[in-house]
Interface confidence: low
């Protein structure tokens, strides 16, 4: 794994990230947002954008205000594009956002990393010479 | 307060093998990636190895892959580094440390440091 | 493995200077870059994670620049406590990887 490529280095910060993030939940603003799941095939990076574009806020209540606000700007990050996205990109018959269940941010950020890890996986089953350690 | 505690350096012969041990408090240890990081005597900062927060992923540095074994029990807090086959370069102070966001906040609390002597 | 260079490797200051130090990546990292303190016989400390970004709790003289292959790390004025070694590290690539190290010394 020592030469993965940068799309796989960005995805799995990004699930790091949403970990930080769990950490300071009870500092999040309590809202409701859609959190996509048991996304349908094909229609990842359409549920990735979800996500990125949810309203996901820092309640300001003091010490952890900088680091939610640094790691909520991180996740917003457009992650450097594949084949898979690209022709993701083009379909249709995916759900919009505002159809998926809307959850507390607990519940959001668990459903964004088990996005991540199924984009994860996807992304190393699909290259024959890929490993998931190094 | 938030604190690493690492142990279980001393000296021993080449050839030889040790376990360090980190004992992690005050933060929610399963959520961080951990890391060691090694310092030779009058040297600068060498990374030896890195497991993320579920031990899904793990790396090592070239000079230590293969004798090596980096491994965590988050029931315990803890973190683990097995030595084999140990060398004379491989003499260091050993740290170990938390990451944060697959290092895009660095790493950024860090042990006292243990030492391990590799002589005969 | 990526390379980081810094410069210069070592540096004589007084108090008040204002003191840059480099690193240079042998390929681009991005913003994947942090800088660390460390003085003898103590573990390393964070300043600046994500190349540009001052740690909480660092003193505000601290900043750091650059993305890609070049960084700055900039102490604006110096205080008799900045004396100590410093050492960038990047995160952007298995293996990770750290500088040299740059000591600043009293001049």
């Known amino acids: 794994m020592q030469g993965q490529d940068r799309h796989m280095i960005r995805m799995r910060q990004l699930i790091d990230i949403v970990d930080q993030l769990k950490n300071y939940v009870n500092d999040l603003v309590p809202e409701f947002l859609p959190a996509p799941e048991d996304v349908e095939t094909n229609c990842e990076w359409s549920a990735f954008s979800c996500f990125q574009k949810a309203q996901l806020k820092s309640a300001n209540t003091g010490n952890n205000e900088r680091i939610i606000n640094v790691s909520i700007k991180k996740l917003k990050r457009k992650p450097p594009s594949t084949n898979a996205g690209r022709r993701q990109k083009h379909r249709l018959t995916c759900p919009s956002c505002d159809s998926y269940e809307k959850k507390p941010p607990k519940e959001f950020l668990e459903r964004f990393k088990s996005l991540l890890q199924k984009m994860i996986h996807q992304h190393l089953s699909s290259r024959t010479h890929g490993s998931e350690d190094s | 307060e938030v604190q690493l505690v690492e142990s279980g350096g001393g000296l021993v012969k080449p050839g030889g093998s040790l376990r360090l041990s980190c004992a992690a408090s005050g933060f929610i240890f399963s959520s961080y990636s951990m890391n060691w990081v090694r310092q030779a005597p009058g040297k600068g900062l060498e990374w030896v190895s890195s497991?993320?927060?579920?031990?899904?992923?793990?790396h090592y540095a070239e000079s230590v892959k293969g004798r090596f074994t980096i491994s965590r029990d988050n029931a315990k807090n803890s973190l683990y580094l097995q030595m084999n086959s140990l060398r004379a370069e491989d003499t260091a102070v050993y740290y170990c440390v938390r990451e944060r966001g697959w290092g895009y906040y660095g790493m950024d609390v860090w042990g006292q440091g243990t030492t391990v002597t590799v002589s005969s | 493995a990526i390379q980081l260079t810094q410069s210069p490797s070592s540096l004589s200051a007084s108090v008040g200077d204002r003191v840059t130090i480099t690193c240079r990546a042998s390929?681009?990292?991005?913003?994947?870059l942090a800088w660390y303190q460390q003085k003898p016989g103590k573990a390393p400390k964070i300043l600046i994670h994500d190349a540009s970004s001052l740690e909480s709790g660092v003193p505000s003289r601290f900043s750091g620049s650059g993305s890609g292959t070049d960084f700055t790390l900039t102490i604006s004025s110096l205080q008799p406590e900045d004396f100590a070694t410093y050492y960038c590290q990047q995160f952007n690539s298995y293996p990770y990887t750290f500088g040299q190290g740059t000591k600043l010394e009293i001049k």
């Open positions: 390929q681009d990292i991005d913003s994947a």
């Open positions: 497991i993320t927060s579920g031990s899904y992923y793990i």
